[in-house]
Protein backbone atom coordinates (compact mmCIF):
# COMPACT_ATOMS: atom_id res chain seq x y z
CA UNK A 1 0.00 0.00 0.00
CA UNK A 2 0.96 3.65 -0.46
CA UNK A 3 3.13 4.70 2.47
CA UNK A 4 2.92 8.46 1.97
CA UNK A 5 1.49 9.00 5.45
CA UNK A 6 4.60 7.40 6.93
CA UNK A 7 6.77 9.76 4.88
CA UNK A 8 4.69 12.72 6.01
CA UNK A 9 4.86 11.84 9.69
CA UNK A 10 8.63 11.20 9.55
CA UNK A 11 9.15 14.60 7.98
CA UNK A 12 6.84 16.19 10.52
CA UNK A 13 8.79 14.51 13.33
CA UNK A 14 12.09 15.73 11.94
CA UNK A 15 10.94 19.32 11.56
CA UNK A 16 8.87 19.92 14.69
CA UNK A 17 9.59 20.04 18.38
CA UNK A 18 12.47 21.21 20.50
CA UNK A 19 15.16 19.61 18.32
CA UNK A 20 13.67 20.87 15.08
CA UNK A 21 15.83 22.92 12.73
CA UNK A 22 15.09 26.63 12.94
CA UNK A 23 13.88 28.33 9.77
CA UNK A 24 17.37 29.72 9.19
CA UNK A 25 18.99 26.34 9.85
CA UNK A 26 18.85 25.46 6.18
CA UNK A 27 21.31 22.52 6.16
CA UNK A 28 19.22 20.67 8.78
CA UNK A 29 15.98 21.51 7.03
CA UNK A 30 17.40 20.44 3.66
CA UNK A 31 18.50 17.15 5.19
CA UNK A 32 14.94 16.58 6.40
CA UNK A 33 13.60 17.44 2.95
CA UNK A 34 16.02 15.04 1.28
CA UNK A 35 14.84 12.29 3.60
CA UNK A 36 11.26 13.17 2.75
CA UNK A 37 11.99 13.10 -0.99
CA UNK A 38 13.77 9.76 -0.64
CA UNK A 39 10.80 8.35 1.25
CA UNK A 40 8.41 9.48 -1.48
CA UNK A 41 10.57 7.94 -4.20
CA UNK A 42 10.65 4.64 -2.31
CA UNK A 43 6.88 4.50 -2.16
CA UNK A 44 6.25 5.89 -5.65
CA UNK A 45 5.30 2.58 -7.24
CA UNK A 46 2.47 2.04 -4.77
CA UNK A 47 1.20 5.64 -4.72
CA UNK A 48 0.32 6.22 -8.36
CA UNK A 49 -2.80 8.39 -8.58
CA UNK A 50 -2.85 9.14 -4.86
CA UNK A 51 -3.83 12.78 -4.31
CA UNK A 52 -1.88 13.12 -1.08
CA UNK A 53 1.22 11.65 -2.69
CA UNK A 54 0.90 14.01 -5.64
CA UNK A 55 0.64 16.96 -3.30
CA UNK A 56 3.58 15.84 -1.14
CA UNK A 57 5.94 15.47 -4.11
CA UNK A 58 5.10 18.93 -5.41
CA UNK A 59 5.38 20.35 -1.90
CA UNK A 60 8.85 18.89 -1.47
CA UNK A 61 10.04 20.33 -4.78
CA UNK A 62 8.69 23.76 -3.86
CA UNK A 63 10.31 23.69 -0.41
CA UNK A 64 13.62 22.53 -1.85
CA UNK A 65 13.54 25.44 -4.29
CA UNK A 66 12.58 27.95 -1.59
CA UNK A 67 15.40 26.81 0.69
CA UNK A 68 17.91 26.30 -2.12
CA UNK A 69 18.39 22.68 -1.12
CA UNK A 70 20.35 20.40 -3.38
CA UNK A 71 19.13 16.83 -3.61
CA UNK A 72 22.65 15.59 -2.84
CA UNK A 73 23.86 15.56 0.70
CA UNK A 74 23.05 14.16 4.12
CA UNK A 75 19.59 13.02 5.11
CA UNK A 76 18.07 13.29 8.57
CA UNK A 77 16.97 10.49 10.88
CA UNK A 78 13.31 10.68 11.89
CA UNK A 79 12.86 11.76 15.51
CA UNK A 80 10.14 10.92 17.94
CA UNK A 81 7.32 13.38 17.50
CA UNK A 82 7.23 16.18 20.07
CA UNK A 83 4.74 18.96 20.56
CA UNK A 84 5.60 22.29 18.93
CA UNK A 85 6.74 24.95 21.39
CA UNK A 86 4.36 27.64 22.62
CA UNK A 87 4.17 30.68 20.40
CA UNK A 88 4.63 28.52 17.33
CA UNK A 89 4.82 30.67 14.22
CA UNK A 90 1.78 28.82 12.92
CA UNK A 91 -0.33 30.48 15.61
CA UNK A 92 -0.71 33.83 13.86
CA UNK A 93 -4.00 35.57 14.54
CA UNK A 94 -3.67 38.54 12.21
CA UNK A 95 -5.81 36.97 9.49
CA UNK A 96 -7.38 39.44 7.07
CA UNK A 97 -11.17 39.79 7.19
CA UNK A 98 -11.60 37.93 3.90
CA UNK A 99 -10.25 34.88 5.71
CA UNK A 100 -13.08 34.83 8.23
CA UNK A 101 -16.25 33.62 6.54
CA UNK A 102 -18.77 35.08 8.95
CA UNK A 103 -17.12 38.50 8.82
CA UNK A 104 -16.57 38.69 5.08
CA UNK A 105 -19.26 36.74 3.22
CA UNK A 106 -22.02 37.92 5.50
CA UNK A 107 -21.07 41.45 6.44
CA UNK A 108 -24.46 42.75 5.37
CA UNK A 109 -26.73 39.82 6.08
CA UNK A 110 -27.87 37.46 8.78
CA UNK A 111 -25.81 34.60 10.16
CA UNK A 112 -25.26 32.01 7.43
CA UNK A 113 -27.33 28.83 7.30
CA UNK A 114 -25.13 25.95 8.30
CA UNK A 115 -25.65 22.40 7.11
CA UNK A 116 -24.17 19.10 8.24
CA UNK A 117 -23.03 15.94 6.48
CA UNK A 118 -21.71 12.82 8.14
CA UNK A 119 -20.42 9.41 7.13
CA UNK A 120 -19.87 6.59 9.58
CA UNK A 121 -20.18 2.86 10.10
CA UNK A 122 -21.19 0.54 7.30
CA UNK A 123 -21.24 3.32 5.87
CA UNK A 124 -24.27 5.40 6.79
CA UNK A 125 -24.58 8.78 5.14
CA UNK A 126 -26.39 11.81 6.47
CA UNK A 127 -26.61 14.32 3.65
CA UNK A 128 -26.63 18.10 3.82
CA UNK A 129 -30.41 17.88 3.39
CA UNK A 130 -30.76 15.46 6.35
CA UNK A 131 -31.47 12.38 4.28
CA UNK A 132 -30.16 9.23 5.93
CA UNK A 133 -28.94 6.39 3.75
CA UNK A 134 -26.92 3.21 4.09
CA UNK A 135 -24.72 2.66 1.09
CA UNK A 136 -22.35 0.15 -0.48
CA UNK A 137 -20.11 2.67 -2.31
CA UNK A 138 -17.08 0.39 -2.38
CA UNK A 139 -13.87 2.01 -3.60
CA UNK A 140 -13.21 5.74 -3.95
CA UNK A 141 -16.17 8.14 -3.92
CA UNK A 142 -16.48 11.93 -3.78
CA UNK A 143 -18.08 12.99 -0.51
CA UNK A 144 -17.75 16.71 -1.17
CA UNK A 145 -16.62 18.44 -4.34
CA UNK A 146 -17.09 22.20 -4.51
CA UNK A 147 -15.06 25.25 -5.40
CA UNK A 148 -13.28 25.34 -2.05
CA UNK A 149 -13.00 21.79 -0.90
CA UNK A 150 -12.73 18.25 -2.17
CA UNK A 151 -13.31 15.26 0.08
CA UNK A 152 -12.83 11.73 -1.19
CA UNK A 153 -13.47 8.56 0.78
CA UNK A 154 -12.35 5.03 0.06
CA UNK A 155 -14.55 2.27 1.43
CA UNK A 156 -13.51 -1.36 1.74
CA UNK A 157 -15.59 -4.46 2.55
CA UNK A 158 -15.92 -5.09 6.27
CA UNK A 159 -15.95 -8.84 5.67
CA UNK A 160 -14.61 -10.82 2.70
CA UNK A 161 -17.21 -10.84 -0.06
CA UNK A 162 -19.41 -8.35 1.75
CA UNK A 163 -21.33 -5.55 0.06
CA UNK A 164 -21.30 -3.72 3.39
CA UNK A 165 -18.26 -1.49 3.47
CA UNK A 166 -16.65 0.99 5.84
CA UNK A 167 -14.34 3.93 5.34
CA UNK A 168 -10.68 2.98 5.30
CA UNK A 169 -9.21 6.13 3.76
CA UNK A 170 -10.10 9.80 3.62
CA UNK A 171 -8.51 12.55 1.54
CA UNK A 172 -9.44 16.21 1.99
CA UNK A 173 -8.11 18.87 -0.36
CA UNK A 174 -8.48 22.47 0.75
CA UNK A 175 -8.10 24.48 -2.43
CA UNK A 176 -5.88 27.53 -2.71
CA UNK A 177 -7.94 30.55 -1.58
CA UNK A 178 -7.01 34.21 -2.09
CA UNK A 179 -4.60 35.51 0.57
CA UNK A 180 -5.84 32.98 3.10
CA UNK A 181 -4.56 29.50 2.36
CA UNK A 182 -2.33 27.58 0.01
CA UNK A 183 -3.68 24.28 -1.29
CA UNK A 184 -3.46 21.80 1.56
CA UNK A 185 -4.12 18.10 1.56
CA UNK A 186 -5.14 16.05 4.57
CA UNK A 187 -5.13 12.29 4.41
CA UNK A 188 -6.14 9.71 6.97
CA UNK A 189 -6.08 5.93 6.71
CA UNK A 190 -6.83 3.02 8.99
CA UNK A 191 -4.42 3.25 11.94
CA UNK A 192 -3.02 6.52 10.64
CA UNK A 193 -4.90 9.64 11.76
CA UNK A 194 -2.32 12.43 11.43
CA UNK A 195 -2.63 15.77 13.16
CA UNK A 196 -1.06 17.55 10.19
CA UNK A 197 -1.48 18.05 6.48
CA UNK A 198 0.53 15.85 4.15
CA UNK A 199 3.26 18.48 3.91
CA UNK A 200 3.70 18.34 7.68
CA UNK A 201 2.10 21.73 8.37
CA UNK A 202 -0.80 22.36 10.74
CA UNK A 203 -2.19 25.49 9.13
CA UNK A 204 -2.87 27.06 5.74
CA UNK A 205 0.71 27.78 4.73
CA UNK A 206 2.64 31.02 4.35
CA UNK A 207 -0.14 33.40 3.36
CA UNK A 208 -1.27 36.27 5.55
CA UNK A 209 -4.45 34.45 6.58
CA UNK A 210 -2.88 31.02 7.00
CA UNK A 211 -4.31 30.64 10.47
CA UNK A 212 -7.83 30.53 9.05
CA UNK A 213 -7.14 26.84 8.36
CA UNK A 214 -6.03 24.85 11.35
CA UNK A 215 -5.77 21.22 12.47
CA UNK A 216 -6.26 20.32 16.11
CA UNK A 217 -5.63 16.89 17.54
CA UNK A 218 -8.36 16.19 20.09
CA UNK A 219 -7.39 12.62 20.96
CA UNK A 220 -4.11 11.28 19.62
CA UNK A 221 -4.69 8.83 16.78
CA UNK A 222 -8.46 8.91 17.29
CA UNK A 223 -9.98 12.36 16.85
CA UNK A 224 -8.91 15.30 14.71
CA UNK A 225 -10.74 18.57 14.09
CA UNK A 226 -10.03 20.83 11.12
CA UNK A 227 -11.24 24.42 11.25
CA UNK A 228 -11.47 26.21 7.90
CA UNK A 229 -12.67 29.62 9.07
CA UNK A 230 -12.22 31.21 5.65
CA UNK A 231 -15.14 29.05 4.43
CA UNK A 232 -16.91 28.79 7.77
CA UNK A 233 -16.33 25.06 7.85
CA UNK A 234 -15.52 22.60 10.62
CA UNK A 235 -14.54 18.99 9.87
CA UNK A 236 -14.27 16.19 12.39
CA UNK A 237 -12.39 13.02 11.48
CA UNK A 238 -12.27 10.08 13.85
CA UNK A 239 -10.90 6.60 13.87
CA UNK A 240 -13.29 4.29 15.68
CA UNK A 241 -12.10 0.70 15.79
CA UNK A 242 -10.48 0.00 12.43
CA UNK A 243 -12.47 2.48 10.39
CA UNK A 244 -12.85 6.22 9.91
CA UNK A 245 -15.80 8.53 10.44
CA UNK A 246 -16.32 11.95 8.88
CA UNK A 247 -18.52 14.87 9.90
CA UNK A 248 -18.68 18.41 8.56
CA UNK A 249 -20.46 21.67 9.31
CA UNK A 250 -20.57 23.93 6.28
CA UNK A 251 -22.52 27.04 5.22
CA UNK A 252 -25.14 26.44 2.51
CA UNK A 253 -23.39 29.00 0.34
CA UNK A 254 -20.22 26.92 0.37
CA UNK A 255 -22.14 23.66 -0.10
CA UNK A 256 -23.68 25.06 -3.27
CA UNK A 257 -20.51 26.71 -4.60
CA UNK A 258 -20.37 24.31 -7.53
CA UNK A 259 -19.55 25.45 -11.05
CA UNK A 260 -20.32 22.28 -12.97
CA UNK A 261 -23.42 20.67 -11.49
CA UNK A 262 -23.29 17.76 -13.91
CA UNK A 263 -19.95 16.56 -12.61
CA UNK A 264 -19.20 18.29 -9.30
CA UNK A 265 -22.83 18.27 -8.16
CA UNK A 266 -22.96 14.49 -7.93
CA UNK A 267 -21.11 14.31 -4.65
CA UNK A 268 -22.54 12.09 -1.92
CA UNK A 269 -23.05 14.71 0.81
CA UNK A 270 -25.21 16.73 -1.58
CA UNK A 271 -27.05 14.17 -3.67
CA UNK A 272 -26.83 11.07 -1.52
CA UNK A 273 -25.82 7.66 -2.81
CA UNK A 274 -26.96 6.46 -6.23
CA UNK A 275 -29.98 4.16 -5.98
CA UNK A 276 -27.97 1.12 -7.08
CA UNK A 277 -25.57 1.75 -4.19
CA UNK A 278 -28.21 2.00 -1.46
CA UNK A 279 -28.98 -0.68 1.11
CA UNK A 280 -32.50 -0.79 2.53
CA UNK A 281 -31.31 -1.15 6.08
CA UNK A 282 -34.67 -0.19 7.56
CA UNK A 283 -36.29 -3.22 5.93
CA UNK A 284 -33.42 -5.30 7.21
CA UNK A 285 -33.94 -3.94 10.71
CA UNK A 286 -37.67 -4.72 10.63
CA UNK A 287 -37.02 -8.25 9.39
CA UNK A 288 -34.28 -8.86 11.92
CA UNK A 289 -36.55 -7.67 14.73
CA UNK A 290 -39.21 -10.11 13.65
CA UNK A 291 -36.86 -13.08 13.54
CA UNK A 292 -35.02 -12.58 16.79
CA UNK A 293 -31.64 -14.18 16.77
CA UNK A 294 -32.11 -15.82 13.36
CA UNK A 295 -29.82 -14.35 10.75
CA UNK A 296 -31.38 -12.90 7.62
CA UNK A 297 -28.68 -13.08 5.01
CA UNK A 298 -31.27 -12.48 2.31
CA UNK A 299 -32.27 -9.17 3.86
CA UNK A 300 -28.73 -7.95 4.04
CA UNK A 301 -26.14 -7.55 1.32
CA UNK A 302 -23.49 -8.57 3.78
CA UNK A 303 -22.48 -12.06 4.79
CA UNK A 304 -23.68 -12.72 8.30
CA UNK A 305 -21.43 -12.01 11.21
CA UNK A 306 -20.65 -14.77 13.69
CA UNK A 307 -23.75 -16.51 15.12
CA UNK A 308 -22.57 -15.51 18.59
CA UNK A 309 -23.98 -12.01 18.01
CA UNK A 310 -27.76 -12.38 18.28
CA UNK A 311 -30.22 -9.59 17.58
CA UNK A 312 -31.04 -9.12 21.29
CA UNK A 313 -27.38 -8.56 22.14
CA UNK A 314 -27.02 -6.03 19.31
CA UNK A 315 -30.06 -4.17 20.55
CA UNK A 316 -28.77 -4.14 24.14
CA UNK A 317 -25.33 -2.87 23.15
CA UNK A 318 -26.77 -0.13 20.96
CA UNK A 319 -29.36 0.94 23.60
CA UNK A 320 -26.53 1.33 26.06
CA UNK A 321 -24.89 4.04 23.96
CA UNK A 322 -27.88 5.29 21.96
CA UNK A 323 -30.98 5.32 24.20
CA UNK A 324 -33.13 7.15 21.61
CA UNK A 325 -34.36 4.69 18.98
CA UNK A 326 -33.56 6.90 16.02
CA UNK A 327 -31.77 6.10 12.77
CA UNK A 328 -28.38 6.25 14.51
CA UNK A 329 -29.58 3.53 16.86
CA UNK A 330 -30.90 1.50 13.91
CA UNK A 331 -27.61 1.99 12.07
CA UNK A 332 -25.82 0.69 15.14
CA UNK A 333 -27.96 -2.47 15.23
CA UNK A 334 -27.52 -3.02 11.49
CA UNK A 335 -23.75 -2.68 11.77
CA UNK A 336 -23.47 -5.07 14.68
CA UNK A 337 -25.58 -7.68 12.93
CA UNK A 338 -23.75 -7.40 9.62
CA UNK A 339 -20.21 -7.19 10.99
CA UNK A 340 -20.13 -8.58 14.50
CA UNK A 341 -17.73 -5.71 15.31
CA UNK A 342 -18.74 -3.96 18.52
CA UNK A 343 -16.72 -0.87 17.56
CA UNK A 344 -19.53 0.10 15.19
CA UNK A 345 -21.59 0.94 18.29
CA UNK A 346 -19.08 3.66 19.11
CA UNK A 347 -19.02 4.83 15.50
CA UNK A 348 -22.78 5.50 15.63
CA UNK A 349 -22.47 7.07 19.07
CA UNK A 350 -19.71 9.46 18.02
CA UNK A 351 -21.50 10.27 14.76
CA UNK A 352 -24.47 11.44 16.82
CA UNK A 353 -22.16 13.37 19.15
CA UNK A 354 -20.68 15.11 16.13
CA UNK A 355 -24.19 15.98 14.90
CA UNK A 356 -24.90 17.56 18.28
CA UNK A 357 -21.79 19.68 17.94
CA UNK A 358 -22.05 20.52 14.25
CA UNK A 359 -25.75 20.64 13.30
CA UNK A 360 -27.28 24.12 13.48
CA UNK A 361 -30.84 22.88 13.93
CA UNK A 362 -31.12 21.23 17.33
CA UNK A 363 -34.57 19.88 16.40
CA UNK A 364 -32.98 17.72 13.72
CA UNK A 365 -30.39 15.94 15.81
CA UNK A 366 -32.35 12.69 15.77
CA UNK A 367 -33.70 11.35 12.50
CA UNK A 368 -36.43 8.73 12.49
CA UNK A 369 -37.81 6.13 10.10
CA UNK A 370 -40.15 7.48 7.50
CA UNK A 371 -41.52 6.57 4.13
CA UNK A 372 -38.81 5.67 1.63
CA UNK A 373 -36.47 8.49 0.63
CA UNK A 374 -36.21 9.67 -2.90
CA UNK A 375 -32.95 8.10 -3.97
CA UNK A 376 -29.88 10.13 -4.80
CA UNK A 377 -29.10 10.65 -8.44
CA UNK A 378 -27.56 7.58 -10.00
Amino acid sequence: PCKILKCNSEFWSATSGSHAPASDDTPEFCAALRSYALCTRRTARTCRGDLAYHSAVHGIEDLMSQHNCSKDGPTSQPRLRTLPPAGDSQERSDSPEICHYEKSFHKHSATPNYTHCGLFGDPHLRTFTDRFQTCKVQGAWPLIDNNYLNVQVTNTPVLPGSAATATSKLTIIFKNFQECVDQKVYQAEMDELPAAFVDGSKNGGDKHGANSLKITEKVSGQHVEIQAKYIGTTIVVRQVGRYLTFAVRMPEEVVNAVEDWDSQGLYLCLRGCPLNQQIDFQAFHTNAEGTGARRLAAASPAPTAPETFPYETAVAKCKEKLPVEDLYYQACVFDLLTTGDVNFTLAAYYALEDVKMLHSNKDKLHLYERTRDLPGRA
Epitope: R41, A44, R48, M64, S65, K71
Partner: antibody, heavy 123, light 108 residues
Framework: EVQLVQSGAEVKEPGASVKVSCKAS????????IQWVRQAPGHGLEWMGW????????NYLQKFQGRVTMTRDTSTRTAYMELSSLRSDDTAFYYC????????????????WGQGTLVTVSS | SYELTQPPSVSVSPGQTARITCSGN??????ASWYQQKPGQSPVVVIY???KRPSGIPERFSGSNSGNTATLTISGTQAMDEADYYC???????????FGTGTKVTVL
Protein backbone atom coordinates in the same frame (compact mmCIF):
# COMPACT_ATOMS: atom_id res chain seq x y z
CA GLU B 1 26.69 -10.95 -18.78
CA VAL B 2 23.26 -9.32 -18.54
CA GLN B 3 21.50 -9.59 -21.89
CA LEU B 4 18.09 -8.97 -23.42
CA VAL B 5 17.42 -10.66 -26.74
CA GLN B 6 14.35 -9.63 -28.72
CA SER B 7 12.34 -11.38 -31.43
CA GLY B 8 12.84 -10.59 -35.11
CA ALA B 9 11.36 -7.92 -37.35
CA GLU B 10 7.66 -8.01 -38.18
CA VAL B 11 5.54 -6.63 -41.01
CA LYS B 12 1.87 -6.10 -40.17
CA GLU B 13 -1.19 -4.68 -41.85
CA PRO B 14 -3.13 -1.80 -40.29
CA GLY B 15 -5.60 -3.03 -37.69
CA ALA B 16 -3.56 -6.14 -36.87
CA SER B 17 -1.69 -6.89 -33.65
CA VAL B 18 1.97 -7.59 -33.01
CA LYS B 19 3.61 -9.38 -30.10
CA VAL B 20 7.29 -8.72 -29.45
CA SER B 21 9.25 -10.98 -27.10
CA CYS B 22 12.27 -10.16 -24.94
CA LYS B 23 14.32 -12.97 -23.38
CA ALA B 24 16.47 -12.09 -20.38
CA SER B 25 19.66 -13.79 -19.24
CA UNK B 26 22.54 -13.18 -16.85
CA UNK B 27 20.48 -11.99 -13.87
CA UNK B 28 17.45 -12.91 -11.75
CA UNK B 29 14.56 -12.10 -14.07
CA UNK B 30 12.05 -11.30 -11.32
CA UNK B 31 14.31 -8.80 -9.55
CA UNK B 32 14.14 -6.04 -12.15
CA UNK B 33 11.31 -4.28 -13.96
CA ILE B 34 11.25 -4.50 -17.75
CA GLN B 35 10.52 -1.27 -19.60
CA TRP B 36 9.40 -0.90 -23.19
CA VAL B 37 10.50 2.02 -25.35
CA ARG B 38 9.82 2.67 -29.02
CA GLN B 39 11.47 4.81 -31.65
CA ALA B 40 9.90 5.70 -34.97
CA PRO B 41 12.41 6.02 -37.84
CA GLY B 42 14.21 9.34 -37.58
CA HIS B 43 12.44 10.21 -34.33
CA GLY B 44 13.21 10.24 -30.63
CA LEU B 45 12.69 7.68 -27.88
CA GLU B 46 9.20 7.22 -26.47
CA TRP B 47 8.56 5.36 -23.23
CA MET B 48 5.58 3.00 -23.44
CA GLY B 49 5.30 1.32 -20.06
CA TRP B 50 6.70 -1.23 -17.66
CA UNK B 51 5.98 -4.68 -16.31
CA UNK B 52 7.01 -6.07 -12.96
CA UNK B 53 8.14 -9.63 -13.78
CA UNK B 54 7.60 -10.75 -10.18
CA UNK B 55 3.91 -9.82 -9.97
CA UNK B 56 2.88 -9.16 -13.56
CA UNK B 57 1.86 -5.63 -12.54
CA UNK B 58 1.98 -3.05 -15.32
CA ASN B 59 1.93 0.70 -15.87
CA TYR B 60 1.31 2.07 -19.37
CA LEU B 61 1.64 5.50 -20.87
CA GLN B 62 -1.86 6.94 -21.27
CA LYS B 63 -1.65 7.13 -25.05
CA PHE B 64 -1.13 3.35 -25.29
CA GLN B 65 -3.75 2.45 -22.68
CA GLY B 66 -6.23 -0.01 -24.18
CA ARG B 67 -3.94 -0.95 -27.07
CA VAL B 68 -0.88 -2.29 -25.29
CA THR B 69 -0.57 -5.40 -23.15
CA MET B 70 2.64 -6.31 -21.37
CA THR B 71 2.99 -9.84 -20.02
CA ARG B 72 5.77 -12.14 -18.87
CA ASP B 73 6.55 -15.83 -18.55
CA THR B 74 8.85 -16.35 -15.57
CA SER B 75 9.56 -19.97 -16.51
CA THR B 76 11.21 -18.88 -19.75
CA ARG B 77 12.44 -15.51 -18.38
CA THR B 78 10.66 -13.75 -21.21
CA ALA B 79 8.71 -10.49 -21.32
CA TYR B 80 6.18 -9.72 -24.04
CA MET B 81 4.71 -6.53 -25.43
CA GLU B 82 1.60 -6.79 -27.58
CA LEU B 83 0.27 -3.78 -29.46
CA SER B 84 -3.13 -4.03 -31.14
CA SER B 85 -5.10 -1.98 -33.69
CA LEU B 86 -1.86 -1.12 -35.45
CA ARG B 87 -1.62 2.06 -37.50
CA SER B 88 1.05 3.23 -39.90
CA ASP B 89 2.46 5.59 -37.26
CA ASP B 90 3.19 2.57 -35.06
CA THR B 91 6.02 1.72 -37.44
CA ALA B 92 9.04 1.82 -35.16
CA PHE B 93 11.82 -0.02 -33.42
CA TYR B 94 10.51 -1.47 -30.16
CA TYR B 95 13.07 -1.90 -27.40
CA CYS B 96 12.83 -3.80 -24.17
CA UNK B 97 15.20 -2.59 -21.47
CA UNK B 98 15.95 -3.54 -17.90
CA UNK B 99 15.34 -0.89 -15.30
CA UNK B 100 18.39 -0.75 -13.07
CA UNK B 101 17.90 0.68 -9.62
CA UNK B 102 19.84 2.16 -6.74
CA UNK B 103 17.72 0.96 -3.83
CA UNK B 104 19.50 3.25 -1.36
CA UNK B 105 18.67 6.43 -3.26
CA UNK B 106 15.56 4.97 -4.93
CA UNK B 107 16.73 6.14 -8.34
CA UNK B 108 16.67 4.28 -11.62
CA UNK B 109 18.02 4.20 -15.15
CA UNK B 110 17.83 1.87 -18.15
CA UNK B 111 20.58 -0.68 -18.73
CA UNK B 112 21.01 -2.82 -20.78
CA TRP B 113 18.79 -2.43 -23.84
CA GLY B 114 17.62 -5.17 -26.15
CA GLN B 115 18.73 -5.00 -29.77
CA GLY B 116 15.34 -3.69 -30.86
CA THR B 117 12.58 -5.17 -33.00
CA LEU B 118 11.48 -3.31 -36.11
CA VAL B 119 7.72 -3.43 -36.57
CA THR B 120 6.54 -2.15 -39.95
CA VAL B 121 2.84 -1.39 -40.39
CA SER B 122 1.92 -1.21 -44.03
CA SER B 123 -0.93 -2.22 -46.28
CA SER C 1 2.52 15.53 -18.35
CA TYR C 2 6.19 16.25 -17.68
CA GLU C 3 8.28 17.41 -20.65
CA LEU C 4 12.01 17.62 -21.33
CA THR C 5 13.38 19.88 -24.03
CA GLN C 6 16.76 19.53 -25.74
CA PRO C 7 18.38 21.49 -28.58
CA PRO C 8 17.97 19.55 -31.84
CA SER C 9 21.67 19.71 -32.67
CA VAL C 10 25.07 20.63 -31.28
CA SER C 11 28.21 20.93 -33.40
CA VAL C 12 31.69 20.68 -31.97
CA SER C 13 35.24 20.48 -33.28
CA PRO C 14 37.37 17.48 -32.32
CA GLY C 15 39.09 18.02 -28.98
CA GLN C 16 36.64 20.75 -27.97
CA THR C 17 33.89 20.58 -25.33
CA ALA C 18 30.31 19.83 -26.24
CA ARG C 19 27.52 20.78 -23.86
CA ILE C 20 24.03 19.37 -24.30
CA THR C 21 21.26 20.85 -22.20
CA CYS C 22 17.99 19.34 -21.09
CA SER C 23 15.30 21.61 -19.66
CA GLY C 24 12.29 20.74 -17.54
CA ASN C 25 10.29 22.24 -14.71
CA UNK C 26 12.26 21.88 -11.45
CA UNK C 27 14.40 19.28 -13.17
CA UNK C 28 17.13 19.80 -10.57
CA UNK C 29 14.94 18.01 -8.02
CA UNK C 30 14.81 14.89 -10.17
CA UNK C 31 17.61 12.51 -11.11
CA ALA C 32 18.56 12.67 -14.76
CA SER C 33 20.07 9.96 -16.96
CA TRP C 34 21.69 10.41 -20.38
CA TYR C 35 21.71 7.90 -23.25
CA GLN C 36 23.91 7.80 -26.31
CA GLN C 37 22.53 6.25 -29.49
CA LYS C 38 24.72 5.73 -32.52
CA PRO C 39 23.13 5.09 -35.94
CA GLY C 40 21.70 1.59 -36.23
CA GLN C 41 22.39 0.76 -32.57
CA SER C 42 20.41 0.54 -29.34
CA PRO C 43 20.84 3.34 -26.80
CA VAL C 44 23.50 3.05 -24.08
CA VAL C 45 23.44 4.83 -20.72
CA VAL C 46 26.39 7.23 -20.36
CA ILE C 47 25.32 9.12 -17.21
CA TYR C 48 22.85 8.22 -14.46
CA UNK C 49 21.88 9.92 -11.19
CA UNK C 50 22.85 13.28 -12.76
CA UNK C 51 26.61 12.68 -12.79
CA LYS C 52 27.55 9.03 -12.31
CA ARG C 53 29.30 7.15 -15.12
CA PRO C 54 28.69 3.44 -15.65
CA SER C 55 31.83 1.32 -15.96
CA GLY C 56 33.19 1.40 -19.50
CA ILE C 57 32.06 4.97 -20.18
CA PRO C 58 35.04 7.31 -20.78
CA GLU C 59 35.86 10.01 -18.23
CA ARG C 60 35.28 12.72 -20.81
CA PHE C 61 31.53 12.27 -20.22
CA SER C 62 30.22 14.20 -17.22
CA GLY C 63 26.88 15.46 -16.04
CA SER C 64 25.33 18.10 -13.82
CA ASN C 65 21.78 19.04 -12.87
CA SER C 66 20.43 22.08 -11.05
CA GLY C 67 17.54 24.50 -11.30
CA ASN C 68 15.60 23.66 -14.42
CA THR C 69 18.51 22.34 -16.48
CA ALA C 70 20.54 19.17 -16.68
CA THR C 71 23.72 19.26 -18.76
CA LEU C 72 25.75 16.52 -20.39
CA THR C 73 29.32 17.64 -21.05
CA ILE C 74 31.70 15.86 -23.42
CA SER C 75 35.25 17.17 -22.89
CA GLY C 76 37.82 16.58 -25.59
CA THR C 77 35.14 15.37 -27.99
CA GLN C 78 36.18 12.60 -30.37
CA ALA C 79 34.74 11.58 -33.72
CA MET C 80 33.37 8.41 -32.10
CA ASP C 81 31.14 10.59 -29.87
CA GLU C 82 29.04 11.60 -32.86
CA ALA C 83 25.58 10.30 -31.98
CA ASP C 84 22.12 11.23 -30.73
CA TYR C 85 21.88 11.95 -27.00
CA TYR C 86 18.72 11.73 -24.92
CA CYS C 87 18.11 12.87 -21.38
CA UNK C 88 15.59 11.01 -19.25
CA UNK C 89 13.91 11.31 -15.85
CA UNK C 90 11.55 9.25 -13.74
CA UNK C 91 8.36 11.13 -12.92
CA UNK C 92 7.57 9.69 -9.49
CA UNK C 93 4.02 11.05 -9.44
CA UNK C 94 2.87 9.02 -12.44
CA UNK C 95 5.62 6.38 -12.20
CA UNK C 96 6.29 7.08 -15.86
CA UNK C 97 9.60 7.73 -17.59
CA UNK C 98 10.10 10.76 -19.80
CA PHE C 99 12.72 11.16 -22.50
CA GLY C 100 14.02 14.45 -23.82
CA THR C 101 13.51 15.39 -27.44
CA GLY C 102 17.04 14.32 -28.35
CA THR C 103 20.16 16.16 -29.55
CA LYS C 104 22.28 15.21 -32.55
CA VAL C 105 25.95 15.84 -31.80
CA THR C 106 28.05 16.40 -34.88
CA VAL C 107 31.84 16.36 -34.65
CA LEU C 108 33.06 18.71 -37.39
Amino acid sequence: EVQLVQSGAEVKEPGASVKVSCKASGYTFTDYYIQWVRQAPGHGLEWMGWINPKTGGTNYLQKFQGRVTMTRDTSTRTAYMELSSLRSDDTAFYYCVREDMNTVLATSWFDPWGQGTLVTVSS
Amino acid sequence: SYELTQPPSVSVSPGQTARITCSGNQLGHKFASWYQQKPGQSPVVVIYEDKKRPSGIPERFSGSNSGNTATLTISGTQAMDEADYYCQVWDVITDHYVFGTGTKVTVL
